[in-house]
C-alpha cells in the first residue's frame, strides 16, 4: 500500500481466484482512544471498533472510503483504491490500446517542432467517474523539468457500437535546447482513476522521434504561359522551428486525379516550389518532413488544379 | 578549420546530408523498434553527443563555429571507429549491399574535410569491449545506428545553416 495523496491510498493487489488478498491496517487520525467505530462509504454498517481497523482487501468491494467516527462525528477518512495485477501484469482496462505504432501503445505523443512543446493523447470508452493526472520529466534517474497543463477532453467519436473519448495534455520542457542532440528521453506518466480503480501508464520518447510538422501553408498555383504546366509554391508552416536554414524541411508533392485509382507520381524536393502538370479536376498536394531525420510526415495540404 | 579557418560549408553540407540518407538506409526501422531499455541513461553516456553548450545552435555558430565543428569532428571519428570495429565486422556478417560500408567511408570523408592533413585535434577514446554473442552485436549495431542518425541530423543542420549564412 502507498499514499497517492493525502488520505488516498493505493492497494496493490495481485489478483487470482481465491487469492488471499492484501492485509491493510487503517489508523484513525485522532488523539482519541476509545469509542471509535469504522464504516465503509455511506453504509451505516459498523465494520469494527478501536483506533485501528485491519481489513483483508480481496476485490473492489473492499475498496472505498473508510471513515472512523466517535459519537456520530467523523474523525478521519482513508480512501482505498485498487491497483490490480493479474498474471503478473498490471491492469490496463481504463485506456484503449491504440496499436500504433505497435501493440500496447496507450499514450501517443506528437511535437510540431523542436521547441520542447509536445501533446500527448489517449483514448477511453469510459464516460464518467474518471480522473487523470500527468507528470513528465527529461530522464528518470536525474530528472529535468517538464511542465504539463490540464488534461482536457479533446474529442468524442462514435464508431458503430463504440463510443470513444479522447483526452489530451500539452507539456513543455522547462529548459529546452532545440539545436542539441537529445541524450535522455522524455518520460510521461499518466495516472488514471476510474471509481476505485487506479492504473498508471507511461511513455518514453525523444522529441526528434515524435516530430510531425504541420502541413505546408499558402499553396499557390500559377499557370505557365502556353503550357500545360503550372508552377506550384508553398511555405513552411508557421509552427515549424526557425531559422529554416537550420531547421530545414523536405517535401513530397503529388498530383491526384479525380479517381483514387489513378496513378499518382510522387516527387521529393527540398525546395518550396515545383513545376507540375496539373490537369482539370485533379488536385495538387504537398506534405513536409524534417529534412535530416525521418520522423513523421505532415498531413497533406491540398489545392484543386482548376 | 583548426586555428579558426572556415570549413568548406557547401561540401560539408552535401556530405552530411548524404550521411543522413545512409544512416537511415542502414537502419530504417525507427518507429517500430524500441531499443531503449533500463540503464540506457548510462550506456548512452559513452557516445559523444552534441549538447547545449557546444555552440551548434544558430547563435553559437555565428559567434564562433569552432567549438561546434570540433565537437562534430570528435563524433564523426568516434562513429567511424565504431563502424570499423568488430561490432560491425564480426558475426553476423553484414549483407554485401549494406550501406554501412558507404556510411563508414562518408564519416571518414567528412571528418577529413573538417581537418585537413597536418592538423590533429585530440579525439575521444572509443570503448573497446565488444559483445561476444552475435545477437548482442546485432542489438548494439541497431543502437549505434539509431544514435548516429540523431548525431548526423544535428551535424547536417549545422552545415546547412553554415552554407546558407556563413559561407564567404
Amino acid at each position: 500500500i502507498w499514499e497517492l495523496k493525502k488520505d488516498v491510498y493505493v492497494v496493490e493487489l495481485d489478483w487470482y481466484p481465491d487469492a488471499p488478498g492484501e492485509m491493510v491496517v487503517l489508523t484513525c487520525d485522532t488523539p482519541e482512544e476509545d469509542g471509535i467505530t469504522w464504516t465503509l462509504d455511506q453504509s451505516g454498517e459498523v465494520l469494527g471498533s478501536g483506533k485501528t481497523l485491519t481489513i483483508q482487501v480481496k476485490e473492489f468491494g473492499d475498496a472505498g472510503q473508510y471513515t472512523c467516527h466517535k459519537g456520530g462525528e467523523a474523525l478521519s477518512h482513508s480512501l482505498l483504491l485498487l491497483h490490480k495485477k493479474e498474471d503478473g501484469i498490471w491492469s490496463t482496462d481504463v485506456l484503449k490500446d491504440q496499436k500504433e505504432p505497435k501493440n500496447k501503445t496507450f499514450l501517443r505523443c506528437e511535437a510540431k517542432n523542436y521547441s520542447g512543446r509536445f501533446t500527448c493523447w489517449w483514448l477511453t470508452t469510459i464516460s464518467t467517474d474518471l480522473t487523470f493526472s500527468v507528470k513528465s520529466s527529461r530522464g528518470s534517474s536525474n530528472p529535468q523539468g517538464v511542465t504539463c497543463g490540464a488534461v482536457t477532453l479533446s474529442a468524442e467519436r462514435v464508431r458503430g457500437d463504440n463510443k470513444e473519448y479522447e483526452y489530451s495534455v500539452e507539456c513543455q520542457e522547462d529548459s529546452a535546447c532545440p539545436a542539441a542532440e537529445e541524450r535522455l528521453p522524455i518520460e510521461v506518466m499518466v495516472d488514471a482513476i476510474h471509481k476505485l480503480k487506479y492504473e498508471n501508464y507511461t511513455s518514453s520518447f525523444f522529441i526528434r522521434d515524435i516530430i510531425k510538422p504541420d502541413p505546408p501553408k499558402n499553396l499557390q498555383l500559377k499557370p505557365l504561359k502556353n503550357s500545360r504546366q503550372v508552377e506550384v509554391s508553398w511555405e513552411y508552416p508557421d509552427t515549424w522551428s526557425t531559422p529554416h536554414s537550420y531547421f530545414s524541411l523536405t517535401f513530397c508533392i503529388q498530383v491526384q486525379g479525380k479517381s483514387k485509382r489513378e496513378k499518382k507520381d510522387r516527387i521529393f524536393t527540398d525546395k518550396t516550389s515545383a513545376t507540375v502538370i496539373c490537369r482539370k479536376n485533379a488536385s495538387f498536394s504537398v506534405q513536409a518532413q524534417d529534412r535530416y531525420y525521418s520522423s513523421s510526415w505532415s498531413e497533406w495540404a491540398s489545392v484543386p488544379c482548376s | 578549420v583548426p586555428g579558426g579557418s572556415s570549413p568548406a560549408w557547401a561540401q560539408c553540407q552535401q556530405l552530411s546530408q548524404k550521411l543522413c540518407t545512409l544512416a537511415w538506409s542502414a537502419h530504417p526501422l525507427v518507429g517500430h523498434m524500441d531499443l531503449r531499455e533500463e540503464g540506457d541513461e548510462e550506456t548512452t553516456n559513452d557516445v559523444p553527443h552534441i549538447q547545449c553548450g557546444d555552440g551548434c545552435d544558430p547563435q553559437g555558430l555565428r559567434d564562433n563555429s569552432q567549438f561546434c565543428l570540433q565537437r562534430i569532428r570528435q563524433g564523426l571519428i568516434f562513429y567511424e571507429k565504431l563502424l570499423g570495429s568488430d561490432i560491425f565486422t564480426g558475426e553476423p556478417s553484414l549483407l554485401p549491399d549494406s550501406p554501412v560500408g558507404q556510411l563508414h567511408a562518408s564519416l571518414l570523408g567528412l571528418s577529413q574535410l573538417l581537418q585537413p592533413e597536418g592538423h590533429h585535434w585530440e579525439t575521444q577514446q572509443i570503448p573497446s569491449p565488444s559483445p561476444s554473442q552475435p545477437w548482442q552485436r546485432l542489438l548494439l549495431r541497431f543502437k549505434i545506428l539509431r544514435s548516429l542518425q540523431a548525431f548526423v541530423a544535428v551535424a547536417a543542420r549545422v552545415f546547412a545553416h553554415g552554407a546558407a549564412t556563413l559561407s564567404p
Epitope: P17, E59, F60, G61, D93, T125, D161, N162, K195 | -
Partner: nanobody, 123 residues
C-alpha cells in the same frame, strides 16, 4: 447507455440444471465486466458470479462455486450463467449487471442492470 435483457429462467427440480442468458446492447458493451446477482424474497440482493471484459477471468461467490459457471460470447454480446446441481435455496430472481470494476461482489460497483429472470427450484 447499456441495455441488459435476461432470459432462461424457469421452474426446475432440485439437482437439475438451467442456463441463463443475458443479451447486452448499447455502446462499448464489450468493455464491461459482467456479473450475475440474485435476490430471494425478503432478502438483500447477493452476488453470484462475475467475468472480466476479456472473458479470461471469472469470480464466484462461495455459495455457488463448483456448481455455477459464468461465460461470455463477445461476438454475440451475451453472457451466460450455467447452473447445475440446483438447490431450493437457489430460488431467486437472477439479475445480470454490467460494470467496469472487476472483480467485485458489491452491487453498487455495477452501473447497469437487467430486469431479472425468475428461477424456482422445487424440492
Amino acid at each position: 447507455e447499456v441495455q441488459l435483457v435476461e432470459s432462461g429462467g424457469g421452474v426446475v427440480q432440485a439437482g437439475e440444471s438451467l442456463r441463463l442468458s443475458c443479451a447486452a446492447s448499447g455502446y462499448n458493451v464489450k468493455d464491461y465486466e459482467m456479473g450475475w446477482f440474485r435476490q430471494a424474497p425478503g432478502m438483500e440482493r447477493e452476488f453470484a458470479a462475475a467475468i472480466s471484459w476479456r472473458g479470461s477471468s471469472t469470480y464466484y461467490a462461495d455459495s455457488v462455486k463448483g456448481r455455477f459457471t459464468i461465460s461470455r460470447d463477445n461476438a454475440k454480446n451475451t453472457v451466460y450463467l450455467q447452473m447445475s446441481s440446483l438447490k431450493p435455496e437457489d430460488t431467486a430472481v437472477y439479475y445480470c449487471a454490467a460494470g467496469r470494476l472487476y472483480p467485485s461482489s458489491r452491487s453498487r460497483d455495477y452501473d447497469y442492470w437487467g430486469q431479472g429472470t425468475q428461477v424456482t427450484v422445487s424440492s
